[in-house]
């Protein structure tokens, strides 16, 4: 299993759990059901993963290939500025918002979108693969 921070970069990834997709050096889980943002976060944490934290535009573009018009929760929140769940600021992409109550972040094939946090959406978890060491 991965050692250290959930948010660290993984080295070469031998395998991912069932129903998880391997992409690059990480495993991704695209949910079938829908939950609110907090429940989605808890789902990921319970599986030694975290709600998707996107590191750069390249990763975002690659993941969007697997997305539709439907929005998915990701590990992004607006708390005096948009920040990822690892504490880093959102600085490589813009997020669309139409209201002050939309403080949780979602993604679809068109980009990032703010949403009110209680609405049920699909979600994406991200984790290191099995038998791997985290790079710091």
């Amino acid at each position: 299993l991965c050692q250290g921070s959930n948010y660290s970069t993984c080295a070469s990834c031998p395998s991912c759990p069932d129903r998880w997709m391997k992409y690059g050096n990480h495993c991704y889980y695209f949910s079938v059901e829908e939950k609110d943002w907090n429940s989605s976060l808890e789902f990921c944490l319970a599986r030694d993963s975290h709600l998707l934290v996107i590191t750069d535009n390249q990763e975002m573009s690659l993941l969007q290939v697997f997305l539709s018009e439907a929005f998915c929760w990701i590990g992004l929140r607006n708390n005096s500025g948009w920040r990822w769940e690892d504490g880093s600021p959102l600085n490589f992409s813009r997020i669309s918002s139409n209201s002050f109550v939309q403080t949780c972040g979602a993604i679809n094939k068109n980009g990032l979108q703010a949403s009110s946090c209680e609405v049920p959406l699909h979600w994406v978890c991200k984790k290191c693969p099995f038998a791997d060491q985290a790079l710091f």
């Epitope: 139409n98 209201s99 109550v101 979602a106 949403s115 609405v119």
Partner: antibody
Framework: EVQLVESGGGLVKPGGSLKLSCAAS????????MSWVRQTPAKRLEWVAT????????FYPDSLKGRFTISRDNAKNTLYLQMSSLRSEDTAMYYC???????????????WGQGTSVTVSS | DIQMTQSPSSLSASLGERVSLTCRAS??????LNWLQQEPDGTIKRLIY???SLDSGVPKRFSGSRSGSDYSLTISSLESEDFVDYYC?????????FGSGTKLELK
């Protein structure tokens, strides 16, 4: 028919407390965000607070944080505003309003109550 | 805070006249703007939401539009019940803020 009926207003001394209620009917209350807005004697409208449908998320202007608390009882279809440490500048007509939330789309304050008057004076 | 500068503060007009009220936003608010109507008894009603969408039951003589940071409410032909107060509301930024109001008076 959507109806919002505020109550609980009145005359209160500076430093005192008051709890306003807003009884909602004609729609599925728990599906909607709700807000409180006040109108000063000078006719200026000011946002006071907003709460999510499930009650898990609340929003306030910095100037009122800590003194005012918005809450709701979805079983009773009622919205509340607890006001404490009241000041003369809190004197206003207080309105509750319904907000339409569709997650990634949000439309503010589509229906308003008739208001309840709060006067803070010694 | 986002400032909403509403003009004019009062407007005298005649029945059947076309009038426009404007709100200027100090920051980008996209289309997150409502127009509200307030009767003399205090009753508040939303007329326009999301800049240009007409609420159900609102007469078609009311319309909303945007040009850059300027948002307008236009009444194409004034009727007697239109001579009341109007406010804009932006809800994109926190806190939501209102214009200072326009009093529409019969000339």
């Amino acid at each position: 028919e959507v109806q919002l009926v505020e109550s609980g207003g009145g005359l209160v001394k500076p430093g005192g407390s008051l709890k306003l209620s807003c009884a909602a009917s004609g729609f599925t209350f728990s599906n909607y965000y709700m807000s409180w807005v006040r109108q000063t004697p000078a006719k200026r409208l000011e946002w006071v607070a907003t709460i999510s449908g499930g009650g898990g998320y609340t929003f306030y202007p910095d100037s009122l944080k800590g003194r005012f608390t918005i809450s709701r009882d979805n079983a009773k279809n009622t919205l509340y505003l607890q006001m404490s440490s009241l000041r003369s500048e809190d004197t206003a007509m207080y309105y509750c309003a319904r907000d339409q939330d569709y997650g990634t789309i949000y439309y503010a304050m589509d229906y308003w109550g008739q208001g309840t008057s709060v006067t803070v004076s010694s | 805070d986002i400032q909403m500068t509403q003009s004019p503060s009062s407007l005298s007009a005649s029945l059947g006249e076309r009038v426009s009220l404007t709100c200027r936003a100090s920051q980008d608010i996209g289309s997150s703007l409502n127009w509200l109507q307030q009767e003399p008894d205090g009753t508040i009603k939303r007329l326009i939401y999301a800049t240009s969408s007409l609420d159900s039951g609102v007469p078609k003589r009311f319309s909303g539009s945007r040009s850059g940071s300027d948002y307008s409410l236009t009444i194409s032909s004034l009727e007697s019940e239109d001579f009341v107060d109007y406010y804009c509301l932006q809800y994109a930024g926190s806190p939501p803020t209102f214009g200072s109001g326009t009093k529409l008076e019969l000339k």
